[in-house]
C-alpha cells in the first residue's frame, strides 16, 4: 500500500517530465530556480528553464543519452552554477558551486532568504495588465510564478501551480468584462491574501521539518489528520502521515518535481480509498488534479464516530501501559495522539502535541517507578491546566478584539510585543503584530468549538514568521529562546514574556517622527502601517509609557495627519504642525 514505491528509472529527469507533463515540468523548474536564485532577472531564469526542458526532452526520447542518468540535484545545481554573475549578486552563495552533491544542494537551501531585498510588487493599472496578459499569456503567467517564488522561497510549489491557474482564470474572465477593475481587483486581492497565508503555513511546515526534525512534523500531521479523518483507522492515518511527510520533506528540500508528483499520487490514493478515510472527500475527488489536491488539504473535519470508548482504558487503566509503551514507544504515543485528536477537533494541534508530550514525559518517569500504575494514574489531571491556558487566553483576547476592533487590537499587540522584545526591528514588529492582530477577525467570529484550533494554530504560523525573520539577523536572546526550545510551546513562551527590563531605551530621533504630504495619498492600510511604525518607535523610546499616554499621543497623531491632509498647503502643515506634535509628544511621554 505504499504510494511512492516506484521502479527505478534510468533517467529521473525523463521520468518526472513524463509524469508531470511539459507545462507543469517547466513551471516547477522555474519555481525551483527562482526560489534558489532570488535576485536573478526573469529572463535569465526563463533561459535556464528552457535549456533544462530541452535537455529533459532528449532524455525522454532516449533515457540512455549522455547525462540523463544524473540526479535532478546534479542537473539543476550544474545549471544554476552556470549563472555568470553568481559571485557579484549572491556573494558567498557562489561558494556552494565548489561543493559536490548533496552538500551543494544543502548549501543552496541554507542561502534561501525569507526576507529578500526585493522591491514591493506594485500592481499596474488593470488595462496595462490585461494588455500584457493578451500580448503574451505564457510570459505573463511565468512572471507571476517567478515573482511569487523569489519572494517566498518556501512556497509550496504544487500549490503555487494552483494559484497560477486561478490567476490565469481571473484574467481570462475579467479582461473581457465590462468593468474590468471591479471584476479583477477583488480576485487579485483574494489571491494575494490567500497566497501570503499559504506561504506562511508552508514556512511553518518547513521550519518544523528542518529545525525540529521529521518526528516533530509527523506528530503534527498525526494530530491534524486524526482531527480531519476521525473515522479512519490509526494505520490509515499513519500511512497518510508517512506519505505526507515525504511530500513536504521533498518540497522543503527543493525537490519540487518529486514533491508535485508524489502529492498527485497521494491525492489519487486518498480519492481511491475515501471510503476508509472520510465521508467529506467526495466533492474534492471530482475536481481536476490541482483543485483536488488543494481541496483535500482544506477539507472540513469528518464527523466523529459516535461510539468512541474512553481513552483511559488503553492509556491509563490498562495494566499493560508500560509494556505497550516499551514495545514500540513512538507507535504507542502516535496512537495516543490519534485517539486524543480524533476526539478533540475543538483543540488546537499544538495543544494536542503538548498533551502528548506531557503523557510521554509521565510514562518515561512512571514506567521506571516502583508502582507505575499508581504513578501515572492521574496523568489526565495534568492536562487540565494545559487546556485551560489557551482557552482563557483566547477568551480574553477575543473580548479585547470585540471591544477595540482590528486596528486598535493590532496596536495593543504592537505595544505588548514591542515591550516584550524591543530589540526586534520595527518593520518585523509591525508585520508580525499586524498579523497576530488578524487572529481576531479570523477566529473570534467562530463558536467556542472552533476558536482554539483556528486561533492557536494560526498564531503558530505567525510566530514562525517572527522566528524565521529573527533567525536571519538575531538580536534578542528571548526570541531565540522561545523560537528554538520547543516548537509547540512557542506561543506560550511568547505569551509568558514580560516587559524586557534589561532594554536600554532608544535615543530619540525627530526624523523618525517626521511626516510628509505623501502619507495623504497612501491607501488606508499603508497609512495604518505608517502610524503603527511610529507607535513601535514610541514604545522603543519610552518602554515604560502607559497605555493612556500612548493612546493620547496616537490620537494626537491621527488628528495631525487628518488635519494636514485637508490643508491647502499640506507640506507646510506637516512641517510646522509636525514639530509641534513631536514637542507635545515628548512632553507627554517625558522624553
Amino acid at each position: 500500500r505504499g504510494v511512492f514505491r516506484r521502479d527505478a528509472h534510468k533517467s529521473e529527469v525523463a521520468h518526472r517530465f513524463k509524469d508531470l507533463g511539459e507545462e507543469n515540468f517547466k513551471a516547477l523548474v522555474l519555481i525551483a530556480f527562482a526560489q534558489y536564485l532570488q535576485q536573478c532577472p526573469f529572463e535569465d531564469h526563463v533561459k535556464l528553464v528552457n535549456e533544462v526542458t530541452e535537455f529533459a526532452k532528449t532524455c525522454v526520447a532516449d533515457e540512455s543519452a549522455e547525462n540523463c542518468d544524473k540526479s535532478l540535484h546534479t542537473l539543476f545545481g550544474d545549471k544554476l552554477c552556470t549563472v555568470a554573475t553568481l559571485r557579484e549578486t549572491y556573494g558567498e552563495m557562489a561558494d556552494c558551486c565548489a561543493k559536490q552533491e548533496p552538500e551543494r544542494n544543502e548549501c543552496f537551501l541554507q542561502h534561501k532568504d525569507d526576507n529578500p531585498n526585493l522591491p514591493r510588487l506594485v500592481r499596474p493599472e488593470v488595462d496595462v495588465m490585461c494588455t500584457a496578459f493578451h500580448d503574451n499569456e505564457e510570459t505573463f503567467l511565468k512572471k507571476y510564478l517567478y515573482e511569487i517564488a523569489r519572494r517566498h522561497p518556501y512556497f509550496y510549489a504544487p500549490e503555487l501551480l494552483f494559484f497560477a491557474k486561478r490567476y490565469k482564470a481571473a484574467f481570462t474572465e475579467c479582461c473581457q468584462a465590462a468593468d474590468k477593475a471591479a471584476c479583477l481587483l477583488p480576485k487579485l486581492d483574494e489571491l494575494r491574501d490567500e497566497g501570503k497565508a499559504s506561504s506562511a503555513k508552508q514556512r511553518l511546515k518547513c521550519a518544523s521539518l528542518q529545525k525540529f526534525g521529521e518526528r516533530a512534523f509527523k506528530a503534527w500531521a498525526v494530530a491534524r489528520l486524526s482531527q480531519r479523518f476521525p473515522k479512519a483507522e490509526f494505520a490509515e492515518v499513519s500511512k497518510l502521515v508517512t506519505d505526507l511527510t515525504k511530500v513536504h520533506t521533498e518540497c522543503c528540500h527543493g525537490d519540487l518535481l518529486e514533491c508535485a508528483d508524489d502529492r498527485a499520487d497521494l491525492a489519487k490514493y486518498i480519492c481511491e480509498n475515501q471510503d476508509s478515510i472520510s465521508s467529506k472527500l467526495k466533492e474534492c475527488c471530482e475536481k481536476p488534479l490541482l483543485e483536488k489536491s488543494h481541496c483535500i488539504a482544506e477539507v472540513e473535519n469528518d464527523e466523529m464516530p459516535a461510539d468512541l470508548p474512553s481513552l483511559a482504558a488503553d492509556f491509563v487503566e490498562s495494566k499493560d501501559v508500560c509494556k505497550n509503551y516499551a514495545e514500540a514507544k513512538d507507535v504507542f504515543l502516535g496512537m495516543f495522539l490519534y485517539e486524543y485528536a480524533r476526539r478533540h477537533p475543538d483543540y488546537s494541534v499544538v495543544l494536542l502535541l503538548r498533551l502528548a508530550k506531557t503523557y510521554e514525559t509521565t510514562l518515561e518517569k512512571c514506567c521506571a517507578a516502583a508502582d507505575p500504575h499508581e504513578c501515572y494514574a492521574k496523568v489526565f489531571d495534568e492536562f487540565k491546566p494545559l487546556v485551560e491556558e489557551p482557552q482563557n487566553l483566547i477568551k480574553q483576547n477575543c473580548e479585547l478584539f470585540e471591544q477595540l476592533g482590528e486596528y486598535k487590537f493590532q496596536n495593543a499587540l504592537l505595544v505588548r510585543y514591542t515591550k516584550k522584545v524591543p530589540q526586534v526591528s520595527t518593520p518585523t514588529l509591525v508585520e508580525v503584530s499586524r498579523n497576530l492582530g488578524k487572529v481576531g477577525s479570523k477566529c473570534c467570529k467562530h463558536p467556542e468549538a472552533k476558536r482554539m484550533p483556528c486561533a492557536e494554530d494560526y498564531l503558530s504560523v505567525v510566530l514562525n514568521q517572527l522566528c524565521v525573520l529573527h533567525e536571519k539577523t538575531p538580536v534578542s536572546d528571548r526570541v531565540t529562546k522561545c523560537c528554538t526550545e520547543s516548537l509547540v510551546n512557542r506561543r506560550p513562551c511568547f505569551s509568558a514574556l514580560e516587559v524586557d527590563e534589561t532594554y536600554v531605551p532608544k535615543e530619540f530621533n525627530a526624523e523618525t517622527f517626521t511626516f510628509h504630504a505623501d502619507i495623504c495619498t497612501l491607501s488606508e492600510k499603508e497609512r495604518q502601517i505608517k502610524k503603527q511604525t511610529a507607535l513601535v518607535e514610541l514604545v522603543k523610546h519610552k518602554p515604560k509609557a502607559t497605555k493612556e499616554q500612548l493612546k493620547a499621543v496616537m490620537d494626537d497623531f491621527a488628528a495631525f495627519v487628518e488635519k494636514c491632509c485637508k490643508a491647502d498647503d499640506k507640506e507646510t502643515c506637516f512641517a510646522e504642525e509636525g514639530k509641534k506634535l513631536v514637542a507635545a509628544s515628548q512632553a507627554a511621554l517625558g522624553l
Partner: nanobody
Framework: EVQLLESGGGLVQPGGSLRLSCAAS????????MVWVRQAPGKGLEWVSM????????YYADSVKGRFTISRDNSKNTLYLQMNSLRAEDTAVYYC?????????????????WGQGTLVTVSS
Amino acid sequence: EVQLLESGGGLVQPGGSLRLSCAASGFTFSLYRMVWVRQAPGKGLEWVSMISQFGNQTYYADSVKGRFTISRDNSKNTLYLQMNSLRAEDTAVYYCAKVRSWDQTGGRRTFDYWGQGTLVTVSS
C-alpha cells in the same frame, strides 16, 4: 507481503471448547485492529469479534457474546479466539482479518487482508 495464518480448528462436541490462533506477518501487527469472521456452510460471512490494537477494547456479535473471548499478543504477532460452550450453529470456517475501516454502529466495515481460514465443526 502480508500473511495471516489461522490454526486450531477441528471437530468438537457441543459444549466443548477450542482456541483458534492467527499468526500475522508482513505488516506492523500492533498498528491494526483485528477481527474474526466466519462463514457457515451455504451462508454468508458473519462478523464474530473485533479487538483494538492493544487489546483493551473488544467487541462481539450478539450470537457469541459471553462464550467467545478475543485476545492478542503483539510481541508474538498473534491473534486468538477462545471459544467455549460451542454449539452446532458455530460450525463454520473461521477467518482472521486485518481491519481497514470500522463503523462500530453497524455501518461500513472493511477488511483488507484475510487468512485462508480454519474449519470448526461442532457435532456430536
